[in-house]
């Protein structure tokens, strides 16, 4: 669901504004990195610096939910196994990949099994 604007109370009994409404962090260039967040309170506006992380893991956050297949067999050559995820639900404004591939190292047990299988195949 598209996130509602975060509402932040401005402290201090003497402050004119009781509640600031902050918009999303908008990167200054491209779709991640340093940018600005605009806040409004009555007729007042403020801009504060913010950062949208550029790491690939962003696609795996709450913005994008995937339905994953079971893990594939261990690849003895790379020592990893793979599974694919299909997009299940995206936040309205989140530009999620339709499918993603996740890899992880094989456990020592599956590594040994994969090596044993490889060895048998060579005989």
């Amino acid at each position: 669901v598209a996130k509602k604007k975060d509402k932040v109370k401005k402290g201090g009994p003497g402050s004119e504004c009781a509640e600031w409404a902050w918009g999303p962090c908008t990167p200054s260039s491209k779709d991640c990195g340093v940018g600005f967040r605009e806040g409004t309170c009555g007729a007042q506006t403020q801009r504060i610096r913010c950062r949208v992380p550029c790491n690939w893991k962003k696609e795996f956050g709450a913005d994008c939910k995937y339905k994953f297949e079971n893990w594939g067999a261990c690849d003895g050559g790379t020592g990893t196994k793979v599974r694919q995820g299909t997009l299940k639900k995206a936040r309205y404004n989140a530009q999620c990949q339709e499918t993603i591939r996740v890899t992880k190292p094989c456990t020592p047990k599956t590594k040994a099994k994969a090596k044993a299988k490889k060895g048998k195949g060579k005989d």
Epitope: V1, A2, K4, K5, G23, P24, T26, E38, T40, T86, L87, K88, K89, A90, Y92, N93, A94, Q95, C96, Q97, E98
Partner: antibody, heavy 117, light 107 residues
Framework: QVQLVQSGAEVKKPGASVKVSCKAS????????MNWVRQAPGQGLEWIGM????????ILNQKFKDKATLTVDISTSTAYMELSSLRSEDTAVYYC??????????WGQGTLVTVSS | EIVLTQSPATLSLSPGERATLSCRAS??????LHWYQQKPGQAPRLLIK???QSISGIPARFSGSGPGTDFTLTISSVEPEDFAVYYC?????????FGGGTKLEIK
């Protein structure tokens, strides 16, 4: 690519209800938000609300909270919008559209609902 | 709710001319602004998403700018098939809202 085919035109009497369907084919129906938009004759576009087929999460324009009910049937890849207590002001073309922030959207051909006594 | 004001209401141009359509939001909507084209008897067609992102299958003469409160749709050289009504829509907060439209007509 997604194709959306809507049900045919309807003529209803004031006070009646109508259920408009929107059948999807092509890419996964259940992954994308389904919007409903209306357009009165000679007027602009007005957003009614949306539903996500994966869990039926619904967000309605408050203006339509007592007017529209959105549902989906995953088994047939069909979205439905039921309009109740129809009035002449509800005469409009009603559109469904499947939205993905990554690829954009696809629209149905529209369903004309005429409310007349 | 966020109000989108489009200007001009009507734009009269000849084919080959440059079209500049404006959409102003009542508050900052980041880049969550989309442009649609609608021809009589047809469903709207998405031209630009998120202020400036192009859409597959849409001619390169259509471009958009933003973000913030002031957005522009530019048609670099108007073709005969571009005469239609253009709407902007915001998806920054609920309810989603559309502008009142700009009618691009032949001069």
């Amino acid at each position: 690519q997604v194709q959306l085919v809507q049900s045919g035109a309807e003529v209803k009497k004031p006070g009646a209800s109508v259920k408009v369907s929107c059948k999807a084919s092509g890419q996964s129906f259940s992954s994308y938000w389904m919007n409903w938009v209306r357009q009165a004759p000679g007027q602009g576009l007005e957003w009614i609300g949306m539903i996500h087929p994966s869990d039926s999460e619904t967000i309605l324009n408050q203006k339509f909270k007592d007017k529209a009910t959105l549902t989906v049937d995953i088994s047939t890849s069909t979205a439905y919008m039921e309009l109740s207590s129809l009035r002449s002001e509800d005469t409009a073309v009603y559109y469904c559209s499947s939205w993905s922030a990554k690829r954009g959207d696809f629209w149905g051909q529209g369903t004309l609902v005429t409310v007349s006594s | 709710e966020i109000v989108l004001t489009q200007s001009p209401a009507t734009l009269s141009l000849s084919p080959g001319e440059r079209a500049t359509l404006s959409c102003r939001a009542s508050e900052s909507i980041s880049n969550n602004l989309h442009w649609y084209q609608q021809k009589p008897g047809q469903a709207p067609r998405l031209l630009i998403k998120y202020a400036s992102q192009s859409i597959s299958g849409i001619p390169a003469r259509f471009s958009g700018s933003g973000p913030g409160t002031d957005f522009t749709l530019t048609i670099s050289s108007v073709e005969p098939e571009d005469f239609a009504v253009y709407y902007c829509q915001q998806s920054n907060s609920w309810p989603l809202t559309f502008g009142g439209g700009t009618k691009l007509e032949i001069k």
